[in-house]
């Protein structure tokens, strides 16, 4: 169920601190605006207060979307979805956020990458990703190329390849040329998830051809 309240919350950390400590979908408000957005809040993992900005779990949602769709978000917050680059950009430019990326493979293993500093540039700068301070179990080297790249979609090619990474690998992502990750790639079912050049990739955990079973990207203020 949607959990609405008269209070205005910028992120799930504010929701958590207001006393709402149950996982679920909450209404968040854009910083310095009255515009609202629905987001899934993880109130249990690692102390709670996490705003889920991406989830892949079953292939039910098409992630080969346009620039505008990645800008405003798509999918279902209770399942597979992308929260929206514009909201995340505005949010992460207000204060310091951490980004946690949780990954599952098809063999029952889980891993994570935690970045102590995360923000997205404005749309004018193509929602370039900025990351620092990597820790975690999903590789000592960042699978999101650093320094960060501009976001690219099938209709917005900002990568560093003469090819068009988003069209070739599918999905919108911070492609390099084309780089060691793409968590918005084509969902591949079990036993069809190896040797996939266009799958859900996190190179420094599972290598280049392995397509993951599930991914979650979540953010939280660093001072939570």
């Amino acid at each position: 169920d949607y959990k609405d309240d008269d209070d205005k919350f910028r992120d799930c950390a504010e929701v958590f601190k207001s006393g709402h400590t149950t996982n679920g979908i909450y209404t968040l408000t854009f910083p310095n605006s009255t515009e609202e957005i629905k987001a899934y809040c993880d109130m249990e993992a690692g102390g709670g207060g996490w705003t889920i900005i991406q989830r892949r779990e079953d292939g039910s949602v098409d992630f080969q979307r346009t620039w505008k769709e990645y800008k405003v978000g798509f999918g279902n917050p209770s399942g597979e979805y992308w929260l929206g680059n514009e909201f995340v950009s505005q949010l992460t430019n207000q204060q310091r956020y951490v980004l946690k990326i949780h990954l599952k493979d098809w063999e029952g293993n889980e891993a994570y990458s935690l970045y102590e500093h995360f923000y997205l540039s404005s749309e004018e700068l193509n929602y370039r990703i900025h990351l620092k301070g990597l820790t975690g179990t999903a590789g000592k080297i960042s699978s999101i190329s650093q320094p960060g790249n501009d976001f690219s979609t099938k209709d917005g090619d900002n990568d560093k390849c003469i090819c068009k990474c988003s069209q070739m690998l599918t999905g919108g992502w911070w492609f390099d040329a084309c780089g060691p990750s793409n968590l918005n790639g084509m969902y591949a079912p079990q036993r069809q998830n190896t040797n996939k050049f266009n799958g859900i990739k996190w190179y420094y955990w599972k290598g280049s051809g392995y397509s993951l079973k599930a991914t979650t990207m979540m953010i939280r203020p660093a001072d939570f």
Epitope: Y119, K132, L134, P147
Partner: antibody, heavy 121, light 107 residues
Framework: DVQLQESGPGLVKPSQSLSLTCTVT?????????WNWIRQFPGNKLEWMGY???????SYNPSLKSRISITRDTSKNQFFLQLNSVTPEDTATYYC??????????????WGQGTSVTVSS | SIVMTQTPKLLLVSAGDRVTITCKAS??????VAWYQQKPGQSPKLLIY???NRYTGVPDRFTGSGYGTDFTFAISTVQAEDLAIYFC?????????FGGGTKLEIK
């Protein structure tokens, strides 16, 4: 291409304030990244002094925190260093530089050519 | 603050030699280490970032490696124009700190 240019007096008297300007061309200082001041002492030791981010937030080296201020003039695409109560130990070449991350310290990819400042009476 | 101890202070080499400079951090700097080259009369120039990534336009004879506390910078085949001072810098924690520099002199 991004260019940074420092300017300011080459000689400052002890106990006075040192004021320097960094003029940036080829990139808006409000768009992204952090804009730093670094100094190099005689003998080549480098010290990061602080930055002002594209959003206007500042971060300073704790060793200078009581004496330093970094501000900006967005209309002129300039940022400034003010260092108060200088002593001869503040004699150095002062550089402005852009770092590759906007909300925290990072490596610096564009540097000015530096301006030499001597503190002496 | 993280202290970056850089060795050696001076390297006297011939053109064509391979040289290695090391930096040891007083505590973990993850892979948030950069290397700079400063030629006489010039400002520092970024060569390597995130310990091992070559900055745009930097020749591939310059390489970096390391993680945690131990970092290495190498020039595979020294050329005359590599005469400079080389600095490491950590930016894992604030304030960012630099090594003391290694002066490379050509015989």
């Amino acid at each position: 291409d991004v260019q940074l240019q420092e300017s300011g007096p080459g000689l400052v008297k002890p106990s006075q304030s040192l004021s320097l300007t960094c003029t940036v061309t080829g990139y808006s200082i409000t768009s992204d990244y952090a804009w730093n001041w670094i100094r190099q002492f005689p003998g080549n030791k480098l010290e990061w002094m602080g930055y002002i981010s594209y959003s206007g937030s500042t971060s300073y080296n704790p060793s200078l925190k009581s004496r330093i201020s970094i501000t900006r003039d967005t209309s002129k695409n300039q940022f400034f260093l003010q260092l108060n109560s200088v002593t001869p130990e503040d004699t150095a070449t002062y550089y402005c530089a852009r770092s590759t991350f906007g909300h925290y310290v990072s490596s610096m990819d564009y540097w000015g050519q530096g301006t030499s400042v001597t503190v002496s009476s | 603050s993280i202290v970056m101890t850089q060795t050696p202070k001076l390297l006297l080499v011939s053109a064509g030699d391979r040289v290695t400079i090391t930096c040891k951090a007083s505590q973990s700097a993850s892979n948030d280490v950069a290397w700079y080259q400063q030629k006489p009369g010039q400002s520092p120039k970024l060569l390597i970032y995130y310990a091992s990534n070559r900055y745009t336009g930097v020749p591939d004879r310059f390489t970096g490696s390391g993680y945690g506390t131990d970092f290495t910078f190498a020039i595979s085949t020294v050329q005359a124009e590599d005469l400079a001072i080389y600095f490491c810098q950590q930016d894992y924690s604030s304030p960012p700190t630099f090594g003391g520099g290694t002066k490379l002199e050509i015989k």
